[in-house]
């Protein structure tokens, strides 16, 4: 079953290569277990950036080596991606699945264009 997912159109990463955005889903029921996946689309290639599952009201659990962190509040997921560089600029798509209880719902956002600008190196100080 399909579900609507909303996310901001554009986000600019900080000078430290950190970008945050909210992924909001219109839950048709009372889901207790949710899976969130962030995918990057660039040059028609799609790659998985990170994925997490969480029980409603709890922290998102990403893999240990993940570049993502996040928190949830109701039907909103606050996602933060770290370690970004200019080459990581692209469309970051939020995918939400309501895993339990049945029925299973899937929603895919339109994507957030994240712009990353590498900081200029500091000039040498004499």
């Amino acid at each position: 079953k399909a579900m609507h997912v909303a996310q901001p159109a554009v986000v600019l990463a900080s000078s430290r290569g950190i970008a945050s955005f909210v992924c909001e889903y219109a839950s048709p029921g009372k889901a207790t277990e949710v899976r969130v996946t962030v995918l990057r689309q660039a040059d028609s290639q799609v790659t998985e950036v990170c994925a997490a599952t969480y029980m409603m009201g709890n922290e998102l659990t990403f893999l240990d080596d993940s570049i993502c962190t996040g928190t949830s509040s109701g039907n909103q997921v606050n996602l933060t991606i770290q370690g970004l560089r200019a080459m990581d600029t692209g469309l970051y798509i939020c995918k939400v699945e309501l895993m339990y209880p049945p029925p299973y719902y899937l929603g895919i956002g339109n994507g957030t264009q994240i712009y990353v600008i590498d900081p200029e190196p500091c000039p040498d100080s004499d």
């Epitope: 399909a2 995918l39 689309q41 799609v46 790659t47 998985e48 994925a51 798509i93 895919i108």
Partner: nanobody, 119 residues
Framework: EVQLVESGGGLVQAGGSLRLSCAAS????????MGWFRQAPGKEQEFVAD????????YYADSVKGRFTISRDNAKNTVYLQMNSLKPEDTALYYC????????????WGQGTQVTVQS
């Protein structure tokens, strides 16, 4: 045209095992993910398990965790569901599904294979 064909369903006693297979045909492709869903008569569709190609990462519904194992053979474009310690409540029509890319949703579905567990 991609086709998914499930097999391996049947009638089994509670506590028994079955191994479901889902073979993809119709071309050479690399799926982002393949999974299993089930639907019992008069009930909503339920997610069972899936596996994502990128890291071979698996995910299971709590109701089957520790009893079911999903695996895939990329060379054969086939995904398997090993079901152990079956319970009467596992009785359902089991569907295989495949995702071409992570942002396409479940693009392809099989016709399903019936699993019946008798107590």
């Amino acid at each position: 045209e991609v086709q998914l064909v499930e097999s391996g369903g049947g009638l089994v006693q509670a506590g028994g095992s079955l191994r479901l297979s889902c073979a993809a045909s119709g071309g050479t492709f690399s799926f982002y993910g393949m999974g299993w869903f089930r639907q019992a008569p008069g009930k909503e569709q339920e997610f069972v398990a899936d596996i994502r190609t990128s890291a071979g990462r698996t995910y299971y519904a709590d109701s089957v965790k520790g009893r079911f194992t999903i695996s895939r053979d990329n060379a054969k474009n086939t995904v398997y569901l090993q079901m152990n310690s079956l319970k009467p409540e596992d009785t359902a029509l089991y569907y295989c599904a495949a995702e071409m890319s992570g942002i396409s949703g479940w693009d392809y579905w099989g016709q399903g294979t019936q699993v019946t567990v008798q107590s």
